[in-house]
């Protein structure tokens, strides 16, 4: 039996059941290479809680249709009193990239997955010449997914100081120049994901071969190599290669341009600081808000929901679009389609399509862009389910009581794009919210003490109480988690204070609440640190005392007590001095 989706065959894919701490390895054409699951396992389940492996799908017992792949096993299971066999079921939907298998749910007997992928489309319009898996799971089973960076047409320009050359890249996929009417990019050879343009000539300096790799929890690496035989004459006999390192920044920030960091004998090293390299839970929510510990921001679009059957209307030339975001109110036109975005043809209002459903919603804030995506709408002829992408812009003076209104900007291959200026898209970053204090008309701002990213370093507290042999290092950041650099590299990711000694590192508290003015000083309390026994968590208080002109002095450890559950630091710094009188 021929492989149903040949493009997906070259790789072993991963999916995760986060709730149950289970990692699945999937090979849809052959078998996964995991001894514990046996020689013919196509779907191998690794339960990290019990440290056990089970084959939940056998490559030999495969059955396939255009949109469903089932792998049975010979293992019995009990489902509602009847004797079944354990199996895995993968539902395929048309997508614009190779995509990723997503775990849906599991019963006693069946493990369900869903996969939106170009391999499942009725037409080849989204298929790449070369594409590789574009996601990884870290050791905590959190997904890092670069699929949103993949360009279906065009490329990214790499920032390089050389005025005579331009290096263009795509992510995980070759560069498609067919939509390009006539720039330098048009000359790039097919299949290249890294194209070097010198003068009027374009050279393939790398094609995707292997999928994305995780090198550290905040660093992902993608390698491109030139497949073609024959050396380029300007490469001194070496084969060209490109390495792109995607770096998750240590704080929220605007996106940056990919930068060339090294170039030698046609070996190009690129670094790209982008929040897409961070784990997906940091960037996305299935609701209409992003907030709390996980995301470092406070965004709430729920006030944009329309009630009482009304919806926003956006004019799209031939079509009208009816939108109701962040709610489950049925749009009247849309015939019980559960649509969040509904497309109605002006010349024939009986032609109605769901352009995205309200239960298929993703809110994403990454690299400074706030986007609401509705997918799973009615199918187009390619098999792709219509989807809508709403790009939000902050506008504090938006009409309609600050709500503003969505504007249709165009359609590309059954994806509908809108922009929406609204005051509800004005993102409050946690630092902005919480890194100051007021006392009547007096204002205090601790942001001068915040350490943002390497090459900056954490503050290290002075502790005179210990001998060199039992020395503990105390690393502190203000209104921000500690940077994982130097001796603090192993610190827990969300710790704002971290103790490091020969036994390892400890979270002494997270940044959860604002600084407070107390007894003439500023008090900063970090809580919810590591467990310290009796169901308690470590807590740290930092007292900041005004010392004009001094932004260099380090904090000092004053006390630690309550059986290691409480730490107190004192910090004499100009940042604790009154800033100015507030207006009004």
């Amino acid at each position: 039996q021929a492989a149903p989706f040949p493009e997906l065959c070259s790789y072993t894919w991963e999916a995760v059941d986060t709730k149950n701490n289970v990692l699945y390895k999937i090979n849809i054409c052959g078998s996964v290479d995991i001894v514990q699951c046996g020689p013919s396992s196509a779907v191998c389940m690794h339960d990290l809680k019990t440290r056990t492996y089970h084959s939940v799908g056998d490559s030999v017992l495969r059955s396939a249709t255009r949109s469903l792949l089932e792998f049975n096993t010979t293992v019995s299971c009990d489902q509602q009193g009847t004797n079944h066999r354990v199996q895995s079921s993968i539902a395929f939907l048309c997508g614009k990239t190779l995509g990723t298998p997503e775990f849906v749910t599991a019963t006693e007997c069946v493990h369900y997955f869903e996969w939106r992928t170009t391999a499942a489309c009725k037409k080849d319009i989204f298929k790449a010449n070369k594409e590789v898996p574009c996601y990884v799971f870290d050791e905590e089973l959190r997904k890092h997914d670069l699929n949103p960076l993949i360009k279906l047409s065009g490329a990214y320009l790499v920032d390089d100081s050389d005025p005579d050359t331009s290096l263009f890249i795509n992510v995980c996929r070759d560069i498609d120049t067919l939509r390009d009417p006539g720039s330098q990019l048009r000359a790039c050879p097919p299949g290249t994901a890294a194209c070097l343009v010198r003068g009027h000539q374009a050279f393939d300096v790398g094609q995707p071969r292997d999928g994305l790799k995780l090198v550290r929890k905040d660093r992902l690496v993608l390698s491109y190599v030139r497949e073609e035989a024959g050396k380029l004459d300007f490469c001194d006999g070496h084969s060209p290669a490109v390495t792109i390192t995607f770096v998750c920044p240590s704080e929220r920030r605007e996106g940056t341009i990919p930068k060339l960091t090294a170039k030698s004998n046609c070996r190009y090293e690129i670094e790209w600081i982008t929040e897409y390299a961070c784990h997906r839970d940091y960037l996305e929510s299935k609701t209409c808000s992003l907030s709390g510990e996980q995301q470092d921001v406070s965004i709430d679009l729920t006030p944009l929901a329309q009630s009482g059957g009304s919806s926003y209307i956006s004019d799209g030339k031939e079509y009208l679009f009816y939108l109701n975001v962040c709610g489950e109110t049925e749009i009247q036109f849309c015939n019980k389609k559960q649509a969040a975005v509904c497309q109605v043809k002006k010349s024939d209002t009986s032609q109605v399509k769901a352009a995205g459903r309200y239960h298929n919603q993703t809110l994403r804030y990454s690299d400074g862009d706030l986007t609401l995506i509705y997918f799973g709408g009615d199918e187009c002829s390619s098999g792709f389910q219509r989807m809508s992408v709403i790009n939000f812009e902050c506008n504090k003076t938006a009409g309609n009581d600050g709500k503003g209104t969505p504007v249709f900007t165009g359609e590309v291959d059954c994806t509908y794009f809108f922009t929406w200026d609204t005051e509800y898209a004005c993102v409050k970053e946690k630092e902005d919210l919480l890194c100051g204090a007021t006392d009547g008309k007096k204002r205090y701002d601790l942001s001068a003490l915040v350490r943002h990213a390497e090459p900056e370093q954490n503050w290290e507290a002075v502790d005179g109480s210990q001998t060199e042999t039992e020395k503990k290092h105390f690393f502190i950041n203000i209104c921000h988690r500690v940077l994982q650099e130097g001796k603090a590299r192993g610190c827990p990711e969300d710790a704002a204070v971290c103790a490091v000694d020969k036994n390892g590192s400890k979270n002494l508290g997270k940044f959860i609440s604002s600084p407070m003015k107390e007894k003439g000083n500023i008090q900063l309390s970090y809580s919810d640190g590591d467990d310290c026994g009796h169901g308690k968590k470590i807590k740290t208080n930092i007292t900041l005392v005004c010392k004009p002109g001094d932004l260099e002095s380090a904090p000092v450890l004053r006390t630690s007590g309550e059986g290691g559950c409480f730490y107190e630091f004192e910090w004499h710094t100009a940042a604790a001095c009154v800033l100015s009188k507030t207006e009004g």
Epitope: S153, A155, L157, S183, E254, I257, N391, E393
Partner: nanobody, 123 residues
Framework: DVQLVESGGGLVQPGGSLRLSCAAS????????WGWFRQAPGKEREFVAA????????SYADSVKGRFTISRDNAKNTIYLQMNSLRPEDTAVYYC????????????????WGQGTLVTVSS
């Protein structure tokens, strides 16, 4: 392909303002990044300002920062360049262009061009 038509150029005194428009038609508006460039007599074409298609992120040449503002009206498929505090050295033919390359300000990465509109700053 995208067709681009610029308008709004003219003669203006130093310190004055002009607003250039660029109407786009043809292939889908929102897959492109948009730029304004200018070419003074006897000089190379130079970058003025750009706006990314997927958001309203903008970039400007140092010489126009704080004076010029690029914007777009997606509903009208139109790009604008608001030019304030104009100087004689801003005299040039201004071109609107489209590119499928992200993060670029290089004119050779822009594949679609308008025919240009002349801006003259003189007293």
């Amino acid at each position: 392909d995208v067709q681009l038509v610029e308008s709004g150029g003219g003669l203006v005194q130093p310190g004055g303002s002009l607003r250039l428009s660029c109407a786009a038609s043809g292939r889908t508006f929102n897959t492109y990044n948009w730029g304004w460039f200018r070419q003074a007599p006897g000089k190379e074409r130079e970058f003025v300002a750009a706006i990314r298609w997927s958001s309203s992120k903008t970039s400007y040449a140092d010489s126009v920062k704080g004076r010029f503002t690029i914007s777009r009206d997606n509903a009208k498929n139109t790009i604008y360049l608001q030019m304030n505090s104009l100087r004689p050295e801003d005299t040039a033919v201004y071109y609107c262009a489209a590119s499928i390359v992200d993060f670029t300000t290089n004119p050779s990465h822009f594949g679609s061009w308008g025919q240009g509109t002349l801006v003259t700053v003189s007293s």
